[in-house]
């Protein structure tokens, strides 16, 4: 396993709809053509896997159906964005790159982003 | 908006190094690729070097690539350029630039992919 550098901003603010976006790079050694991106999720000191996609370099990424998160990729980047987020999902999210074909393997982690989650304030009664 | 300022260029003898920074005001520098470009007496401004905004990713004119190192420092707002193995033909002025937009993936030697740039500062090789 050789390591690999990623990059990912370091905080995020995520809308009021709960939608956050951010951006994974990473630092491709060779001419990868099989890639894996997983969106790890910590908070306090417990790391949980959110999403992940493996691509062909060049296409779409593709989620499972029921996954909160959707992305694209272009060269040595991908936009990735997730869904349904809400206040107790504030936390460090993390990227992982690993290049899975063909060989050797690299593996690359990103610092991670912190996503802030606010929730809406519900909108007040109306007499009208 | 964004000032570049460009420092460390000089006069040096061939085979000499040089080592020029770029320090950029505002709080986005993380999000935008980095350049440096050079324009020597009498001729077109040209790409020298570039570097990803998350620092990941270098890219290199051919005619600097193995002489000239790009980095950068997000903490510090900065964007440097080693020079080494400086030869008489690459005495002119350096620009730094800064990419036009956050988190591009549209990695280019382009002028027209960068928005802002610096005043430049002279470098001189001497043979």
């Known amino acids: 396993c050789k390591a690999m550098h990623v990059a990912q901003p370091a905080v995020v603010l995520a809308s009021s709809r709960g939608i956050a976006s951010f951006v994974c790079e990473y630092a491709s050694p060779g001419k990868a053509t099989e890639v894996r991106v997983t969106v790890l999720r910590q908070a306090d000191s417990q790391v949980t896997e959110v999403c992940a996609a493996t691509y062909m370099m060049g296409n779409e990424l593709t989620f499972l159906d029921d996954s909160i998160c959707t992305g694209t990729s272009s060269g040595n980047q991908v936009n990735l964005t997730i869904q349904g987020l809400r206040a107790m999902d504030t936390g460090l999210y993390i990227c992982k790159v690993e290049l899975m074909y063909p060989p050797p393997y690299y593996l690359g982690i990103g610092n991670g982003t912190q996503i802030y989650v606010i929730d809406p304030e519900p909108c007040p009664d109306s007499d009208f | 908006e964004v000032q570049l300022v460009e420092s460390g260029g000089g006069l040096v003898q061939a085979g000499g190094s040089l080592r020029l920074s770029c320090l950029a005001s505002?709080?986005?520098?993380?999000?935008?690729?980095m350049g440096w470009f050079r324009q020597a007496p009498g001729k077109e401004r040209e790409f020298v070097a570039a570097?990803?905004?998350?620092?990941?990713?270098?890219y290199y004119a051919d005619s600097v690539k193995g002489r000239f190192t790009i980095s950068r420092d997000n903490a510090k707002n900065t964007v440097y350029l080693q020079m080494n193995s400086l030869k008489p033909e690459d005495t002119a002025v350096y620009y730094c630039?800064?990419?036009?937009?956050?988190?591009?993936?549209?990695?280019?030697?382009?002028?027209?992919?960068?928005?802002?740039w610096g005043q430049g500062t002279q470098v001189t090789v001497s043979s």
């Open positions: 630039a800064r990419g036009s937009a956050p988190y591009s993936s549209s990695r280019s030697s382009a002028q027209e992919t960068y928005a802002q």
């Open positions: 570097i990803s905004w998350g620092g990941v990713n270098t």
């Open positions: 505002g709080r986005t520098f993380s999000s935008y690729d």
